[in-house]
């Protein structure tokens, strides 16, 4: 299915416009901003979601900018260029003709340049480390229970296969979730770790992208797991190219 047929909505992306104008009167949904058709049986790509987010009228926006400490996009939100499959184009430019190269999750991986900047390929982010700090609880969570519940969450809510959740580390109050997915491992139909991480990030912030599903209610043996801060680190298959000036 591409969308819920009865009321023609997109369960996996509320930033869509849906109408029964698909083949045979089937419900078809298009992402805001880009107008691209989306498959509502799976997660929408981060690129299309960012584009939809930027297209939403500012006064009506229910979604907020990432917090300063999130390492996801420390350049802030931008209106990305997406390819016909909804992936980030390797080169992104703003309205003042400043350009930069991004990885598959849309994070800048080079210094900024001008229109002459070349980005030969979209470099894949193959390893994502999600670093969470949970609110104080009566005691520490059981590590194996926490591991099982987080893998179940990624499987059931984001449809990310457990094999892509490489590890769950826990040293109270810090939880680290490692997602790994090489190009060779990702089969057709597999959810991308970058998309799963973005949906998770938005869920943690109380900005769920799902339509009609409740917000994230994460519990370990009945005990609520409440996150008070999130940091996300991205590792690319090819190391980024920043000048020494930036590194100092």
């Amino acid at each position: 299915h591409t969308a819920a047929q009865d009321n023609c909505t997109c369960p996996t992306n509320k930033m869509t416009v849906c109408s029964p104008d698909g083949p045979g009167g089937r419900c078809q949904c298009r992402a805001l901003g880009s107008g691209m058709a989306v498959d509502c049986s799976t997660l929408t790509s981060k690129c299309l979601l960012l584009k939809a987010r930027m297209s939403a009228p500012k006064n009506a926006r229910t979604l907020v900018r990432p917090s300063e400490h999130a390492l996801v996009d420390n350049d802030g939100l931008y209106d990305p260029d997406c390819d016909p499959e909804g992936r980030f184009k390797a080169r992104q430019c703003n309205q003042t003709s400043v350009c930069w190269c991004v990885n598959s999750v849309g994070v800048r991986r080079t210094d900024k340049g001008d229109l002459s900047l070349r980005c030969d390929e979209l470099v894949r982010t193959h390893h994502i480390l999600i670093d969470l700090r949970h609110r104080p609880t009566a005691g520490a969570f059981n590590h194996s229970d926490l591991d099982a519940e987080l893998r179940r969450l990624f499987r059931e809510r984001y449809r990310l296969h457990p094999k892509f959740v490489a590890a769950v580390h826990y040293e109270q109050p810090t939880i680290q979730i490692e997602l790994r997915q090489n190009t060779s491992q990702k089969a057709a139909g597999d959810v991308d770790i970058g998309d799963a991480a973005y949906y998770f990030e938005r869920d943690i912030k109380g900005e769920s992208l799902f339509q009609g599903r409740g917000g994230l209610d994460l519990r370990v043996r009945g005990e609520p797991l409440q996150v008070e801060r999130t940091l996300i680190y991205y590792l690319d298959e090819i190391p980024p190219k920043f000048s020494m000036k930036r590194l100092t």
Partner: antibody, heavy 120, light 110 residues
Framework: QEQLKESGGGLVQPGGSLTLSCKAS????????VSWVRQAPGKGLEWIAY????????YYATWVNGRFTISSHNAQNTLYLQLNTLTAADTATYFC?????????????WGPGTLVTVSS | DVVMTQTPASVEAAVGGTVTINCQAS??????LAWYQQKPGQPPKLLIY???KLASGVSSRFSGGGYGTEFTLTISGVECADAATYYC????????????FGGGSEVVVK
């Protein structure tokens, strides 16, 4: 050929314990999740527990209440279900069932089952 | 806890006819529903997954439909070999679940 084969069933007294085994062959155990499902004589299917062997993640039906334990020996491609404090209500055929390898929980490979009879 | 309710518990079908079995989920499971066929003395066999997709080697006489909370299994051109008990199963979650299977529907072929 992909196969699952349960063993370890038999007659056990009320209050007793039993460990069931499920041997997998023809596929790599670590790429799938596996469940135990039981069926009392003339009744419907009842899910018991699920394990994702690679990470030893285990999940149980709410009614299990710690009486049963699912585990696996990955090198031997074998799944186990330990049954404790058995009562007559636990009399059933116990099946192991493998998921299809995706992210939903449909079971496309089943063993023939092993019968557990709890009686004095 | 998602509870699955199947109707009818038993249904008679004539050879060559059509039979429909219903399954209702207590809350939305989107399209995460599977159907199984079980014959006496045998383990269940997966027929349909994701509400409408035919499992490998299953006859196209079997079809599934529905979304959210209401689902159907339809057997068209019923054959004697279709006499069995059919079970639906929510395939969405194993968290806080009592039993993901419906109670079963027996199909008797006349």
């Amino acid at each position: 050929q992909e196969q699952l084969k349960e063993s370890g069933g038999g007659l056990v007294q009320p209050g007793g314990s039993l460990t069931l085994s499920c041997k997998a062959s023809g596929f790599d155990f670590n790429n799938y999740g596996v469940s135990w499902v039981r069926q009392a004589p003339g009744k419907g299917l009842e899910w018991i527990a699920y394990i994702y062997p690679t990470y030893h993640n285990t999940y149980y039906a709410t009614w299990v209440n710690g009486r049963f334990t699912i585990s696996s020996h990955n090198a031997q491609n074998t799944l186990y279900l330990q049954l404790n404090t058995l009562t007559a209500a636990d009399t059933a055929t116990y099946f192991c069932a493998r998921d299809a390898g995706g992210t939903d929980y449909n079971f496309n490979l089943w063993g023939p089952g092993t019968l557990v009879t709890v009686s004095s | 806890d998602v509870v699955m309710t199947q109707t009818p518990a038993s249904v008679e079908a004539a050879v060559g006819g059509t039979v429909t079995i219903n399954c209702q989920a207590s809350q939305s499971i989107e399209s995460y529903l599977a159907w199984y066929q079980q014959k006496p003395g045998q383990p269940p066999k997966l027929l349909i997954y994701e509400a409408s997709k035919l499992a490998s080697g299953v006859s196209s006489r079997f079809s599934g439909g529905g979304y959210g909370t209401e689902f159907t299994l339809t057997i068209s051109g019923v054959e004697c070999a279709d006499a069995a008990t059919y079970y639906c199963q929510q395939a969405l979650t194993i968290g806080n679940v009592d039993n993901p299977f419906g109670g079963g529907s027996e199909v008797v072929v006349k």
